[in-house]
């Protein structure tokens, strides 16, 4: 019993003056609280509480369920307690069969004893099964048995409290331990697609998958920079214990341009939060944007190859693509493919392969593409660079020597005179007349140039060279002069 210095309020005294009392079942419990300022008796066992305002607590025929802590409290709020065991051979344990534990915390198996003199008070697995090797427990006859540091692996563990009474092992009713997991990581969140492109009026639907150890994970779809609550639908599954999955699907049945933006799937648990975003772009109608991968004006040498390459964005997806030249459609020599295999890809590539181009194959090559909303095209102007070709070299009736050459780019014609039989003609002769013959003709193909000189200027035997050249190469034609007396006997042109 408590002792205090005089003058200070003191706790009540209890008779019998013991901390514990053992009573046989059926016998009387008689407890007296001695205090001038008596207020009440309180009885507690498991989660049950009873009160009595009389200073004497009397239970005429004690039962096992009268086992528990009896506390007397005075008007100063001071109290004294006695613990009473009601020994009942037929009921060794008082039990509250609900058993929940939080992972990594201790939990109490509530099976207080009605007889403190039994031995081997412990836990046993149901149906003779052993307890997990790492399960540690601490028995307390007045409270029950504490399991230390509960593990997830103990979830749904079936167990009994056990004690030896007069040499025999006695088991309590069974307990099923339910373990609540500790959140040791943030939820795992993922989204069905990172970006969406839609036309006005189309349905927007996106699914966020949230994975965690418990269904008590919080999740929501949010629109960035908006507080509006979004309508979402859920599906959820337990793929076994501590393996929970939720699918939160956000739907806008008829998307509008102003629905465009970033949508965030946010999830959190007691450990922390995670989020993932998806971007929605709503356009009023479809589009096609073409990007040439090479210059749209192409110069290529005769006999060489060239690839005309475009990339284009098309939404909705392209339905028809074609390459055209001179109103003719290519059936082969081209390929069209998506830039990536990604489901949300809107970028494509088209390539036209032109091989061993001839001078006559210059011109406009057009790529056309269409989808259900729009058409688009792009033109490439292809110029074939050709070495000049001398088409004609003649002495005209008026005594002029004329050279006509064709090539691309436009050839330049120079004239040279070689006296005697020299092969190297160095002295240049100025032309009398130079004309580009097809300047007003088609814009592609060879350009024809005509140049003339006056042959009367030549007084000696020799050779005249007509030399046509451009960036690609050069070609020459020759006129031979032979004089007999004062007359030009012959002019023999040759290349």
């Amino acid at each position: 019993q408590p002792s205090v210095s005089p003058g200070e309020p003191s706790p009540p005294s209890i008779h019998p003056a013991k901390s514990e009392l053992i009573v046989r079942v059926g016998n009387e419990i008689r407890l007296l609280c001695i205090d001038p300022g008596f207020v009440k008796w309180t009885f507690e066992i498991l989660d049950e509480t009873n009160e009595n305002k009389q200073n004497e607590w009397i239970t005429e025929k004690a039962e096992a369920t009268n086992t528990g802590k009896y506390t007397c409290t005075n008007k100063h709020g001071l109290s004294s307690s006695i613990y009473v065991f009601v020994r009942d051979p037929a009921k060794l344990f008082l039990v509250d069969r609900s058993l929940y534990g939080k992972e990594d915390n201790d939990t109490l198996v509530r099976c207080p004893l009605t007889d403190p003199e039994v031995t081997s008070y412990s836990l046993k697995g149901c149906q003779g099964k052993p307890l997990p090797k790492d399960l540690r427990f601490v028995p307390d006859p007045k409270a029950g048995i504490t399991i230390k540091s509960v593990k997830r692996a103990y979830h749904r563990l079936c167990l009994h409290c056990s004690a030896d009474q007069e040499g025999k092992s006695v088991l309590s009713d069974k307990f099923i331990l339910k373990v609540r997991p500790a959140f040791k990581a943030v939820p795992v969140v993922s989204v069905s697609k990172a970006s969406y492109l839609l036309r006005e009026g189309e349905e927007f639907t996106v699914t966020c998958t949230i994975k965690d150890v418990s269904s008590s994970v919080y999740s929501t779809w949010k629109r960035e920079n908006s507080q509006t609550k979004l309508q979402e639908k859920y599906n959820s599954w337990h793929h076994g214990d501590f393996n929970y999955e939720r699918q939160a699907t956000l739907t806008i049945s008829s998307a509008r341009v102003n629905d465009s933006g970033v949508f965030m799937c946010y999830a959190n648990n007691t450990f922390g939060s995670a989020n993932v975003t998806t971007t929605l772009e709503v356009v009023d109608k479809g589009f096609i944007n073409i990007f040439p991968m090479i210059n749209t004006t192409v110069f290529v040498n005769d006999g060489e190859n060239v690839d005309l390459i475009v990339e284009y964005e098309a939404f909705p997806k392209p339905e028809h693509q074609q390459w055209i030249y001179m109103n003719r459609t290519f059936t082969d020599k081209w390929e069209d493919y998506p830039k990536s295999e990604n489901e949300s890809n809107i970028r494509y590539v088209s390539e036209l392969h032109l091989t061993r181009l001839k001078g006559t194959e210059g011109g406009t090559y057009t790529f056309l593409v269409s989808n259900s909303d729009v058409n688009a095209s792009i033109a490439f102007n292809v110029y074939v660079n050709t070495k000049p070709e001398i088409l004609t070299y003649d002495r005209l009736v008026n005594g002029m020597l004329q050279c006509v050459a064709a090539g691309f780019p436009e050839p330049t014609i120079d004239w040279y005179f070689c006296p005697g039989t020299e092969q190297r003609c160095s002295a240049s002769v100025l032309p009398v007349d130079v004309q580009t013959l097809n300047a007003s003709g088609p814009p592609f193909g060879k350009l024809v140039v005509q140049s003339s000189i006056d042959s009367s200027a030549f007084k000696h035997n020799g050779t005249v060279e007509c030399k046509a050249y451009n960036d690609v190469g050069k070609t020459s034609a020759y006129f031979n002069f032979a004089f007999k007396g004062n007359n030009k006997e012959q002019i023999h042109p040759h290349t």
Epitope: E48, S98, Y100, R180, S215, H238
Partner: antibody, heavy 119, light 106 residues
Framework: QVQLVQSGAEVKKPGSSVKVSCKAS????????ISWVRQAPGQGLEWMGG????????NYAQKFQGRVTITADESTSTAYMELSSLRSEDTAVYYC????????????WGRGTLVTVSS | DIQMTQSPSSLSASVGDRVTITCRAS??????LNWYQQKPGKAPKLLIY???SLQSGVPSRFSGSGSGTDFTLTISSLQPEDFATYYC????????FGGGTKVEIK
Amino acid sequence: QVQLVQSGAEVKKPGSSVKVSCKASGGTFSLYAISWVRQAPGQGLEWMGGIIPAFGTANYAQKFQGRVTITADESTSTAYMELSSLRSEDTAVYYCARGGLDTDEFDLWGRGTLVTVSS
Amino acid sequence: DIQMTQSPSSLSASVGDRVTITCRASQSINSYLNWYQQKPGKAPKLLIYAASSLQSGVPSRFSGSGSGTDFTLTISSLQPEDFATYYCQQGVSDITFGGGTKVEIK
């Protein structure tokens, strides 16, 4: 033994809300899953949602999403279910039960609260 | 949602009869199936959890079996206090109950 004690019967007008309470008389209330299950006259059982008080986040059946709010007060070991925008078809006995989340079975039931919705 | 289909919806039997009630899930629910008994004006009472585990205090004449999609509740010898309505319930997805089986006296 633990008991779940529910609040008394209610009569409500269409369009209004009702809040039913469920007090647990002991045990580790914070770790319980407390669910709400309703039963219309002569009909079967319908899960509305539930909460584990220690975790604080409620789960709701799709049908009741946005119309039901389940909360728990650990200090008083009491769970609450509020149902808004009541209509006549919400007339039912509303049970609170221990279990129903994270694969827990319903091993303990309250006695039920009759909610009548009538104009 | 996972649909739970109970059959039959009602049955008449006599004391001492063996009674079998079946429950089929619209998709696999492993063994996350529970059985309840409900008497008029009372709350349901858990009989079987995890498809086949008998709840404490429930007589051993009640037994459960099955996994995946098909489950059975068996009452080996029907007693007068067993006349009631029985419900199955799955716990894999949002919780759903079967429509109930009413066991009546023949």
